[in-house]
């Protein structure tokens, strides 16, 4: 019995569907055929769970969490005994081993290993200002994702005809903060921030409103 | 009473321009920006544009790019959108709203009651 | 570029549950919130929800409003339908600066 080598590692956007492959060649009829899928999740590497069980010409279900979420792609017993996994969850994240045994063949690999990565695109981000608008004041933009794998980068530009940000202004990418110094009547505007990875973009906006001081009354 | 009160009907023929007008009351007019969105006879909402009454600021729709203007008053406290070239696919009832920027989104709390512009030949 | 589709129409007997979907086309229905809004005959439209499930102090709490990623979509849920119910509703959402604010096609909702 040999279990093909696998692709290494597979990457899906959560919530869509993945297929994890593992297929085999034997030189035994498939009666005794039992196959065992495991998972090790990156979130708790020394608890490893069942995804999913064929024995004795049944299918079982694992761990509760695949429930009604895993099932192999083809009609079984076969030598093909990939599963699909719908609606994928950040917590399906993972390295997945196949275990394939076919009674009389013994000897040969009969394990076969692939990653999962469930991938996140950055959620809505909140768009917010620190500091004072005075003018005159420094104030910092801040932008920032709660979720997101890869982990995103934030990009920050002023809605005007250039969408240029002020010369004062320091962009952070990694943070998502940008430092406008010494803030002008000029500063004012609408700025978005545009928070993006590997699947996908998200944007917010904000409204700096720069506070010119009032002029006194001289008595 | 805080408010939109828009302009009254407009028959326009094709190729003309029209104004609308959109006067906000018992609210800090440039505090909040304004937006227009219209509505084809029997068809959803159609996002216009906005403005910063606080600077004139204007962002608009690629669609009506080159066609549409927003201005304001911030003396009466009234904001106007101007659509020329008009064409027939225009006849539609034109909203003002005011827009709120909740940890970064727009949505529209504040609605006028519309103004209805024909476009006829 | 994505879109947001609703169906048509739905309808249903007072006292009973109705929930509207508002699909996105393309990238992911957490990226940006959904707002709704109910615009009844010869009316302006109203915000019901906004930021996907916030409902401003003045919406009775029969309207909610909810996401589900593995459909891609957001939904309004209205609970104890009444015959006041019976308007178009439009979810939105903002699309960056390609598309800026952007609308749902609007669903009539008629109670039988």
């Known amino acids: 019995l040999e279990v093909s080598e696998s692709p290494g590692s597979i990457q899906v956007a959560r919530g869509q569907p993945a297929v994890l492959p593992c297929t085999f060649t034997t030189s035994a009829a498939l009666i005794n055929l039992n196959v065992i899928w495991m998972v090790t999740p990156l979130s708790n590497a020394n608890q490893p769970e069942q995804v999913i069980l064929y024995q004795g010409g049944q299918m079982f279900d694992g761990a509760p969490r695949f429930h009604g979420r895993v099932g192999f792609t083809g009609t079984m017993p076969a030598t093909n005994v990939s599963i699909f996994i719908n609606n994928t969850q950040l917590s399906d994240t993972g390295t997945y081993q196949c275990l394939v045994n076919n009674l009389p063949d013994i000897g040969g690999r009969n394990i076969g290993v692939t990653g999962l990565t469930v991938l996140v695109p950055p959620s809505a981000p909140h768009c917010q200002i620190q500091g004072s608008q005075d003018i005159g004041s420094d104030v910092i933009l801040l932008c920032s994702s709660e979720e997101g794998i890869p982990r995103p980068t934030y990009l920050w530009e002023k809605l005007d005809n250039t969408l240029k940000l002020p010369p004062t202004a320091t962009q952070d990418q990694v943070q998502g903060t940008v430092t406008i110094r010494n803030i002008s009547a000029l500063s004012s505007g609408l700025y978005q921030c545009v928070a993006s990875n590997a699947i996908g973009t998200s944007t917010c906006l904000l409204d700096l409103q720069v506070i010119s001081p009032q002029p006194r009354n001289i008595g | 009473q805080v408010q939109l009160v828009q302009s009254g009907a407009e028959v326009k023929k094709p190729g003309a321009s029209v104004k609308v007008s959109c006067k906000a009351s018992?609210?800090?007019?440039?505090?909040?920006?304004m937006h227009w969105v219209r509505q084809a006879p029997g068809q959803g909402l159609e996002w216009m544009g906005w403005?910063?009454?606080?600077?004139?600021?204007?962002g608009y729709a690629q669609k009506f790019q080159g066609r549409v203007t927003m201005t304001r008053n911030t003396s009466i406290s009234t904001a106007y959108m101007e659509l020329s070239s008009l064409r027939s696919e225009d006849t539609a009832v034109y909203y003002c709203?005011?827009?709120?920027?909740?940890?970064?989104?727009?949505?529209?709390?504040?609605w006028g009651r519309g103004t209805l512009v024909t476009v006829s030949s | 570029n994505f879109m947001l589709t609703q169906p048509h129409s739905v309808s249903e007997s007072p006292g009973r549950t109705v929930t509207i979907s508002c699909t996105r086309s393309?990238?992911?229905?957490?990226?940006?919130?959904v707002q709704w809004y109910q615009q009844r005959p010869g009316s302006a439209p109203t915000i019901l929800i906004y930021?996907?499930?916030?409902?401003p102090s003045e919406v009775p709490d029969r309207f909610s409003g909810s996401i589900d990623i593995s459909s891609n979509s957001a939904s309004l849920t209205i609970s104890g339908l009444k015959t006041e119910d019976e308007a178009d509703y439009y979810c939105q959402s903002y699309g960056g600066t390609s598309q800026g604010v952007l609308f749902g096609g609007g669903t009539k909702v008629t109670v039988l």
């Open positions: 018992g609210y800090t007019f440039t505090g909040y920006y």
């Open positions: 709203a005011r827009g709120r920027l909740e940890r970064g989104y727009w949505y529209f709390d504040l």
């Open positions: 393309s990238g992911s229905i957490t990226s940006n919130y």
């Open positions: 403005i910063n009454p606080n600077s004139g600021n204007t």
């Open positions: 930021e996907d499930k916030e409902r």
